[in-house]
Amino acid sequence: PLATIPVSTTSLTSSEGSTISTPSVDISTPVTTSIVGDQCSRCKNGGFWDGLKCQCLTPYYGESCEEVVNSIDIAPPETVSAQMELTVTVTSVKFTDELKNHSSQEFREFNKTFTEQMNIVYSGIPEYVGVNITNLRLGSVVVEHDVLLRTKYTPEYKTALDNATEVVKQKITKVTTEQIMTNDNCSALMCFNTTGTQVQNITVTQYDPVEECRQKAEEYEDYFLVEYRDQKPYCISPCESGFNASKNCNHGKCQMSQNGARCLCVTTETHWYSGEDCNQGTQKSHHHHHH
């Protein structure tokens, strides 16, 4: 059996010119709703019936998942990071096999001293988090280690991290050139072999809000775009108001279709509206006016 749900209707005209009569509450709400039987078929676009309502997949919403949302949540990470794999040669410590054992007194003391030295070297780099020794080997002591950098996510995070990695390179080059053994003496916390300093690899967090936005928009990827507000990215369709890319439908409603955003123009008791942006109003002749 079918139940008829009464709704007030507003006449809408698409910008192509055809007039359609739709409910004023939600243009996708069906006037008749199946009360019994298989509910699965009423959830469109991959949505599923949970026993009470349709659970819609992004970017859809509505009773039958037929509407396309105006904005999609994208969540950039709070912080972004970079990891630099570096090698330096420490000449002021004799290598022993005990240094390979991370639980030995030798390793713990070396790690403590090396960390203190690097904290001094990299002080003044706001993105600097710390160092992590990954391997120690003979020659005097070849120290393979990671320098960890972190910063708050902003649209310019890559530039900030790239700049920080450059400063790390400059500072490690400077200290390993200056703090060297002279006449078998090292007056610093640690001394280095200048030629043993190498940057092996740099890994930077990859986060692209545009890519996330496009992925989540699925078949509407060409019509969703990223705009920033207070350094935060928003994934929006032109139907979302308040952004540079927002479509102004004037006397109408913006609706997403697979061909992009279009305006559905309103027809009131006194006027009908047309045009791509529903900005062309035509007054109805008086004898068509119904009280």
């Epitope: 000449t91 004799k94 003391e109 070396f110 053994m181 078998d184 090292c186 007056s187 610093a188």
Partner: nanobody
Framework: EVQLVESGGGLVQPGRSLRLSCAAS???????MGWFRQAPGKEREGVAG???????IYADSVKGRFTISKDNAKNSLYLQMNSLRAEDTALYSC???????????????????RGQGTMVTVSS
Amino acid sequence: EVQLVESGGGLVQPGRSLRLSCAASGDITRRCMGWFRQAPGKEREGVAGISEDGITIYADSVKGRFTISKDNAKNSLYLQMNSLRAEDTALYSCAASILNRVGCRQLSYEYIYRGQGTMVTVSS
């Protein structure tokens, strides 16, 4: 973590002697060791140092009067101070490097372990 505890300080008359000891909680065989002092209102200065292979070095102001030595079996460092002067009055502390430290044959080396110190007052 190596704990260093100094002892032997006190009040002594000019020209007399004192022997300071520094007991370490761990192995000092493969460490550079040193004695530092800080007089009231002055900066800390290196007094004497001994490298991991037993080579010693002294500040000019104490050369010929002070002798640094270490007993690896007892994990102890010593400073024999003779012909003491009023200007030797200071808080004396010992320091130790990390294990296997080389190239610390000078007094400016930054040691990573330090004791609390023992006070030496030279006065008549």
